[in-house]
């Protein structure tokens, strides 16, 4: 569904913007912020994961990286998979801008996207079957 | 290429319709590298509330429920895009901002042996 949420109030003394729209500058603040050097936690974790890059030229940013847990269980001290524990994905919402082509016109839509960031090892919830 | 400034529909489309947020709500407690969630609120930002994870322990929880310092709890960080009101306080004029958030924690084999 395209049902979204509106989180704005009526403008008072701000730049005029057409009704039902907002002005968005996509020059990113903190674009060059210092990110820590690669820590390789995805391969050192007891719930290791791999990365897949998704590419969409009509999305900004075009590149979104998704993690996938490598195992169902967790890796024990011996380097073996322990299926008494579960590797589970940790997810985070982010915003992207979607470009939509409708005939000769182009419109832009903000979207919330759920990104899988990595995995963690959890004790399983036991589902007792009646 | 995207233009530097765009006019965007006020409705934010949620592509996460098939996800159940409750599904992962207790991972922070069940993880071998458990974390606490701290509320970060900023009315000049959308979303105005972001939950920041802080690992509960330096080590990881072992099968006996004790902290094992042979393993390390480490935050999993992610850069996300948010909207920053620009100029400040304006309800419908924004700029994208990249922020680094800790989403949860994972247990890793150490590469740094601080303790002999």
């Amino acid at each position: 569904g395209s049902e979204g949420e509106t989180f704005f109030q009526k403008p008072e003394s701000c730049p005029p913007v057409p009704g039902g729209s907002m002005k968005l500058d996509i020059g990113i603040i903190n674009e060059n912020q210092r990110v820590s050097m690669s820590r390789n936690i995805e391969s050192r974790s007891t719930s290791p994961w791999d990365y897949t890059v998704t590419w969409d030229p009509n999305r900004y940013p075009s590149e979104v990286v998704q993690a996938q847990c490598r195992n169902l269980g967790c890796i024990n001290a011996q380097g073996k998979e322990d299926i008494s524990m579960n590797s589970v994905p940790i997810q985070q919402e982010t915003l992207v801008v979607r470009r939509k082509h409708q005939g000769s016109s182009v419109s832009f839509q903000l979207e919330k996207v759920l990104v899988t960031v990595g995995c963690t090892c959890v004790t399983p919830v036991i589902h007792h079957v009646q | 290429n995207f233009p530097r400034t765009v006019m965007v529909n006020l409705n934010i489309h949620n592509r996460n319709t098939n996800t159940n947020p409750k599904r992962s709500s207790d991972y922070y407690d069940r993880s071998t590298s458990p974390w606490n969630l701290h509320r970060n609120e900023d009315p000049e930002r959308y979303p105005s509330v972001i939950w920041e994870a802080k690992c509960r322990h330096l080590g990881c929880i072992n099968a006996d429920g004790n902290v094992d310092y042979h393993m390390n709890s480490v935050p999993i960080q992610q850069e996300i895009l948010v909207l920053r009101r620009e100029p400040p306080h304006c309800p419908n004029s924004f700029r994208l901002e990249k922020i680094l958030v800790s989403v949860g924690c994972t247990c890793v084999t150490p590469i740094v042996h601080h303790v002999a």
């Epitope: - | 802080k54 690992c55 509960r56 322990h57 330096l58 390390n72 480490v74 150490p110 601080h114 303790v115």
Partner: nanobody, 123 residues
Framework: QVQLVESGGGLVQPGGSLRLSCAVS????????MGWFRRPPGKEREFVAA????????KYADFVTDRFTISRDDAKSTVYLQMNSLKPEDTAVYYC????????????????WGQGTQVTVSS
Amino acid sequence: QVQLVESGGGLVQPGGSLRLSCAVSGRTFSSYAMGWFRRPPGKEREFVAAISWSGGDTKYADFVTDRFTISRDDAKSTVYLQMNSLKPEDTAVYYCNDMPYGLDTRMDEYEYWGQGTQVTVSS
């Protein structure tokens, strides 16, 4: 700009005590973990102690052997190191820093250190 201001060092006799303080400003104090490090004369900087954000979890280097206690006061954005039963080999410049990756934080990841506080243990 981040600032780490260590204080409380000095000259003390073997067996004596000192309490070091580190005031943190310019960033959120309640980082995942905070740590104390030291650089003995002519040696590399080494880890001394760490404390989790909640203060409920602490870890010490083996040479500490129950002589030191790390604590933190979030209201004052300060981390402390209580040092008892000091030995001549504890002579060093002591530094504090946050440990954003806890015990996994590498020395080479730090882009900023404070000036440190000199601790000299001598009779």
